[in-house]
């Protein structure tokens, strides 16, 4: 028993960020005379939150009218709570002293914990595109949440991924926390329409997790397959040769025709057709005037896709009196670096 007790009935209070925290405090006596002050923390570095005697505390309101006669309720409300407000709050009775007021009795303290929602997860992929069968890393980041407990999952097209590593920082006590996760994803040729999803679940989200997405269309490069074929004669002394460029992504592609190694024509893919899997097909044709050639003609379709080293396919055109349709059975010639060395 004491002549004056400061009672803080709540050991802890949990408040969502943006809301108002109510910190309760009553005194059992008004004697001795002196103000109540609220502090965050204890010891010499404590922070003054409210002083009944003087000062301007715009975020703080008193629950009771402290000018009301013989009021012994010194509870306060703190508005617009942020994670930075977390800590232990002490209601402290001072007594008049000479010359300064003297700390007389402190409440046991109320720990204010702030529930703060995580920010929307941001998923980012590799800086450069990669081809199917390669493994790429995606990162997911979310910030500003509290308490520290959080769950993060990765999905690819609805299927949960297991190859990922997650860190929550800082390790020790903090007003708010951040999560960082890196997932490894193996690309397939069908991934143009695929999505990678990072899903974050936290107590503040009430069972409705936040999601961040990345489209693999931003990450994948599907190299084209080439097929050069000779079409039936269109006119006397003319042969139509087509180059089928199939299953490529992204669309950025430049094709060059070579006749016996000399550039005949260069064009950029424009009117492409899209496949169900999101890849593109394109066809280019070359009209060859056979009479202009005495010898056999080697036609090469050379494709530079998405800034990568060129790949090519050739077709030998036999010069004869009656040209007939010929299929292409020659092997592709790689005129640049190996097409797999692309990143």
């Amino acid at each position: 028993e004491e002549e004056l007790q400061v009672i803080q009935p709540d050991k802890s209070v949990l408040v969502a960020a943006g809301e108002t925290a109510t910190l309760r405090c009553t005194a059992t006596s008004l004697i001795p005379v002196g103000p109540i002050q609220w502090f965050r923390g204890a010891g010499p570095g404590r922070e003054l939150i409210y002083n009944q005697k003087e000062g301007h505390f715009p975020r703080v309101t008193t629950v009771s009218d402290l000018t009301k006669r013989n009021n012994m309720d010194f509870s306060i409300r703190i508005g617009n709570i942020t994670p930075a407000d977390a800590g232990t709050y002490y209601c402290v009775k001072f007594r008049k002293g000479s010359p300064d007021d003297v700390e007389f009795k402190s409440g046991a303290g109320t720990e204010l914990s702030v529930r703060a929602k995580p920010s929307a997860p941001v998923v980012s992929g590799p800086a450069a595109r990669a081809t199917p069968q390669h493994t790429v890393s995606f990162t997911c980041e979310s910030h500003g949440f509290s308490p520290r407990d959080i769950t993060l999952k990765w999905f690819k097209n609805g299927n949960e991924l297991s190859d990922f590593q997650t860190n929550v920082d800082p390790v020790g006590e903090s007003v708010s926390y951040s999560i960082h996760s890196t997932a490894k994803v193996v690309l397939t040729r069908e991934d143009v329409h695929s999505q990678v999803i990072c899903e974050v679940a936290h107590v503040t989200l009430q069972g409705d997790p936040l999601r961040g997405t990345a489209n693999l269309s931003e990450t994948i490069r599907v190299p084209p397959t080439l097929e050069v074929t000779q079409q039936p004669v269109r006119a006397e002394n003319q042969v139509n040769v087509t180059c089928q460029v199939r299953k490529f992504y992204p669309q950025r592609l430049q094709l060059t025709w070579l006749e016996n190694g000399n550039v005949s024509r260069t064009e950029t893919a424009s009117t492409v057709t899209e496949n169900k899997d999101g890849t593109y097909n394109w066809m280019s044709w070359l009209l060859v005037n056979v009479s202009a050639h005495r010898d056999d003609v080697k036609l090469t379709c050379q494709v530079e896709h998405d800034g990568q080293p060129a790949v090519s396919k050739s077709h030998d055109l036999k010069v004869s009196a009656h040209p007939k349709e010929q299929g292409s059975n020659t092997a592709a010639e790689n005129t640049g670096s190996n097409e797999r060395n692309i990143y």
Epitope: L30, G34, N70, N71, R95, K96, F104
Partner: antibody, heavy 114, light 111 residues
């Protein structure tokens, strides 16, 4: 129940130091302050000072240079020392609990005389 | 120092009548929404007995015949109705400012 009892010599010579003891029961001296008050014969009450639960003290400025209040919590005792006494210090001396002065001792009479 | 002036210095009241004692402070004894003025009753050979604290609050065990009022500098102790054993000296006291001070006292006699 709460009790306070003053004790000390009933007669003190002028210029000497008056020493009184207040022995308390029913409450803790760490939780409550104790006042000293005096009342000269046929006159009103005069507050001398208080020792708080944390052992800090406040004194009547008119007596501050001569008065010391201390305590021995383990013995439940509060002490008053008043130095350089004169006949004007003749009074009944009371101890009373807390800032509220809700419990009083019966008082002890101190006469200053040679 | 805050000087407390009580009036009257003495009064004689018949049983069943009302007795009113005033206490005027040289400066306000109000702080933080309360008046730090208290009243005591003292009978001969006895220590003072608390009656009223914080201007108007009755101490436990004190009959409801006693009441206190006032704020700032002017305070009143009322005994209604007066009984024979109310004969005593009555003191006001402030502990709003150091040094804590008492009024000079009012002697109540029963006719």
């Amino acid at each position: 129940q709460v009790q306070l009892q003053e004790s000390g010599p009933g007669l003190v010579k002028p210029s000497q130091t008056l020493s009184l003891t207040c022995t308390v029961s029913g409450f803790s001296l760490t939780g409550y302050g104790v006042n000293w008050i005096r009342q000269p014969p046929g006159k009103g009450l005069e507050w001398i000072g208080i020792i708080w639960g944390d052992a800090s003290t406040d004194y009547n400025s008119a007596l501050k240079s001569r008065v010391t209040i201390s305590k021995d919590t383990s013995k439940n005792q509060v002490f008053l020392k008043l130095s350089s006494v004169t006949a004007a210090d003749t009074a009944v001396y009371y101890c009373a609990r807390a800032g509220k002065m809700d419990y009083w001792g019966q008082g002890t009479t101190v006469t200053v005389s040679s | 120092d805050i000087v407390l002036t009580q009036s009257p210095a003495s009064l004689a009241v018949s049983p069943g009548q009302r007795a009113t004692i005033t206490c005027r402070a040289s400066e306000s004894v109000d702080s933080y929404g309360s008046s730090f003025m208290h009243w005591y009753q003292q009978k001969p050979g006895q220590p003072p007995k608390p009656l009223i604290y914080l201007a108007s609050n009755l101490e436990s065990g004190v009959p409801a015949r006693f009441s206190g009022s006032g704020s700032g500098t002017d305070f009143t102790l009322t005994i209604n109705p007066v009984e024979a054993n109310d004969a005593a000296n009555y003191y006001c006291q402030q502990n709003n400012e150091y040094p804590w001070t008492f009024g000079g006292g009012t002697k109540v006699e029963i006719k």
